[in-house]
Interface confidence: medium
């Protein structure tokens, strides 16, 4: 099938790193500088991304692959392959349209970055709060009151809490 | 589970408008986006909003896109106005998680922009 192919469109023999000259008789030609192609038998060559500004270079662009970006310090990721950068707030903070602001009571943001997210609900998995939840934390879940019976060790560990970045809707 | 499913897509002439929407569920979202991918080409971003209003566009689309989110039906929108054949793409809704460190993908909408 592939020499059928071939046969058909030449270009599908030029590989990663070339591209498919039309001007030059449909021979396979280099990826000119700063620009690449991941895959074989394509016409053009991607423009190479450039990490200017915000963003730093985390891999160099080749022949066969676009350069990856990420943030200077002080900035995050966001989106996919790091489409954007944002600036860092505390922990116990989250990045609003008038800069960074402190997470509202009953919410917390244990990172520089994200949002705050609400304190896990212990009640609803029938456990109290064993620690208070702060900005920064979220609160401990342990078991309820109920759940000690007469001459139980009251140093049972607790429960774990929940996995950070799962709360409830 | 995470679910982002697109709609919205479709023909549309040259100068035209569409409204691309994304119905989100499963997490609790910092930051939702839009990107597309033209055929044989590269995905590319289009433009963010965050879950307190803040937005951001690409070069290309800034000043006919507008992009939009409803946090009580965990929806995102796409309005697109003066629309150009190199709008043409399959449009993709994403979603970062509630810390910034995972990307959700819808399955994409196809676009076409053809007299």
């Known amino acids: 099938f592939e020499r059928t192919r071939s046969l058909q469109d030449p270009c599908s023999n030029c590989p990663a790193g070339t591209f498919c000259d039309n001007n030059r008789n449909q021979i396979c030609s280099p990826c000119p500088p700063n620009s690449f192609s991941s895959a074989g038998g394509q016409r053009t060559c991607d423009i190479c991304r450039q990490c200017k500004g915000v963003f730093r270079t985390r891999k160099e662009c080749s022949s066969t692959s676009n350069a990856e970006c990420d943030c200077t310090p002080g900035f995050h990721c966001l989106g996919a392959g790091c489409s954007m950068c944002e600036q860092d707030c505390k922990q116990g903070q989250e990045l609003t349209k008038k800069g960074c602001k402190d997470c509202c009571f009953g919410t917390f943001n244990d990172q520089k970055r994200g949002i705050c997210r609400p304190w896990t609900n212990c009640s609803l998995d029938g456990k109290s709060v064993l620690v208070n939840g702060t900005k920064e934390r979220d609160v401990v879940c342990g078991p309820s009151p109920a759940d000690l019976s007469p001459g139980a060790s009251s140093v049972t560990p607790p429960a774990p809490a929940r996995e950070p970045g799962h709360s409830p809707q | 589970q995470v679910q982002l499913v697109e709609s919205g897509g479709g023909l549309v002439q040259p100068g035209g408008s569409l409204r691309l929407s994304c119905a989100a569920s499963?997490?609790?979202?910092?930051?939702m986006f839009w990107y597309r991918q033209p055929q044989g080409k590269q995905r590319e971003y289009v433009a963010h909003i965050t879950s307190n209003g803040r937005t951001n566009y690409a070069d290309s689309v800034t000043g006919r896109f507008t992009i939009s989110r409803d946090n009580n039906k965990n929806t995102l929108y796409l309005q697109m106005d003066s629309l150009r054949a190199e709008d043409t793409a399959v449009y993709y809704c994403a979603a970062d998680d509630a810390t910034n460190t995972r990307t959700y993908w819808g399955q994409g909408t196809l676009v076409t922009v053809s007299s």
């Open positions: 499963g997490d609790i979202f910092s930051i």
